[in-house]
């Protein structure tokens, strides 16, 4: 039996990571021991799972790593990897400083809102995650058809504003569609704006007919596809 030890301490020499906002940060604590140790991460001394972080985090236990994409000022802090087994434990601290960029148009997380397929009568949630230096505002738009056309004479799509909201820069904005029908199918756009400009991302909602209960035991309410 052997207490945990660092297998590549030379890869851990860079203690302070000062990165511009919007960049990706990767912390690694490669270790070994017998029995094989587990790794946990703390932020400023508290257990860290990234649930309150826009974009979340990626924990790759086989690589002993923590990855955070599109870092923002609220990600600043001390990140501790805690490696332990039945014999003992070791820890290492990384310091993260996020250098604020110039104020920019809102950045929308890639892949959101996501293309979604749902069954008639089910409920759907479309998500939009926004990163913005300035306080952003959001609109949800549905692309509509007028007189058989999706576009006006000016070349711009016809849209209907479904929801307008001011949000905090780290919030996830959700559009709830209850009891969807075939008419709800189509293209939806999340528009985020701030004092610099607007940014858009779109997704398609496909609505399938109600499934026959005689041949399906339990259909999921909504299936999400990228």
């Amino acid at each position: 039996q052997q207490a945990p030890y660092w297998t590549h301490p030379q890869r851990m020499e860079k203690k302070l990571h000062a990165v511009p906002a919007g960049n990706t940060v990767k912390f690694r604590c490669p270790a070994a021991g017998n029995p094989t140790p587990t790794i946990r991460w703390l932020k400023d001394g508290q257990a860290f799972h990234g649930e309150n972080r826009i974009g979340g985090i990626r924990l790759r236990h086989q690589h002993w790593s923590l990855v955070m994409e599109s870092v923002v000022p609220s990600d600043r802090g001390t990140y501790t990897c805690l490696v332990e087994n039945a014999v003992g434990s070791i820890r290492y601290n990384y310091l993260l400083d996020v250098l604020e960029r110039s104020p920019h148009r809102p950045i929308l997380q890639a892949g959101l809102p996501a293309n979604t397929t749902a069954v008639v009568g089910s409920d759907v949630e479309l998500l939009c995650k926004v990163y913005s230096d300035a306080q952003p505002h959001i609109q949800w738009l549905k692309h509509i058809v007028i007189n058989g056309s999706s576009f006006g004479a000016d070349g711009f799509p016809y849209v209907q504003v479904l929801k307008t909201a001011d949000i905090n820069s780290s919030e996830v904005e959700v559009l709830y569609l209850r009891n969807v029908s075939a008419e709800d199918a189509g293209e939806y756009t999340c528009l985020a704006g701030n004092s610099i400009g607007l940014s858009y991302q779109s997704a398609w909602l496909t609505v399938l007919p109600e499934e026959d209960p005689t041949w399906t035991a339990a259909a999921p309410e909504a299936r999400y596809t990228d």
Epitope: S102, R105, Q139, V159, L191, N194, L198, Y200
Partner: antibody, heavy 124, light 112 residues
Amino acid sequence: EVQLLESGGGVVQPGRSLRLSCAASGFTFSSYAMHWVRQAPGKGLEWVAVISYDGSNKYYADSVKGRFTISRDNSKNTLSLQMNSLRVEDTAIYYCVRGAGRGYTRGPDGFDIWGQGTMVTVSS
Amino acid sequence: DIVMTQTPLSLSVTPGQPASISCTSSRSLLHSDGKTYVYWYVQKSGQPPQLLIYELSNRFSGVPDRFSGSGSRTDFTLKISRVEAEDVGVYYCMQYVEAPLTFGGGTKVEIK
């Protein structure tokens, strides 16, 4: 007709102050961010400052930070630029420019409407 | 800050001939939403700048179709397919991604 009309320019000595105004008409002023851009005589364009639609966010060029203050009065459809500690290099035509709106627009999201400009001369 | 570099400084064109102005940005202007936020303006003598092209290649309303914008990420071009006498002025590119918004130094277009 969408219009922006600047006023308040003039000749002022270095170190003194001046307040520029921009009167907006023909659009919902309170729904748009607004910018100031300046142009020194015979030179190019330089962005000066922006203010969000509700006045909660303001950003400035480094060259004017701490000396200029952008503000707005949505009840009067007016944008202002308070210029303190003026320097000779602040001599320029100052343009008021409409920025991004609060929502979907069928066209560019700002920097489409410019005022005629007001001349500020800083000279001893 | 994003630096916008414009070439040439000046351009003398025969009416009816094409003209091309280049603009290079120090960083990519391709935003996360897939749009490229470069704008083109013309400033005629004694007037404020007038918008010609927005979001890389979209002509602003009322702009003649002899004006076109193209490019990608950091390299952009404004083309006038057939220059007319009224096209005389100084042309500017601008990045509209982040503050401070920055402009190219300008290209003066004259008629031969």
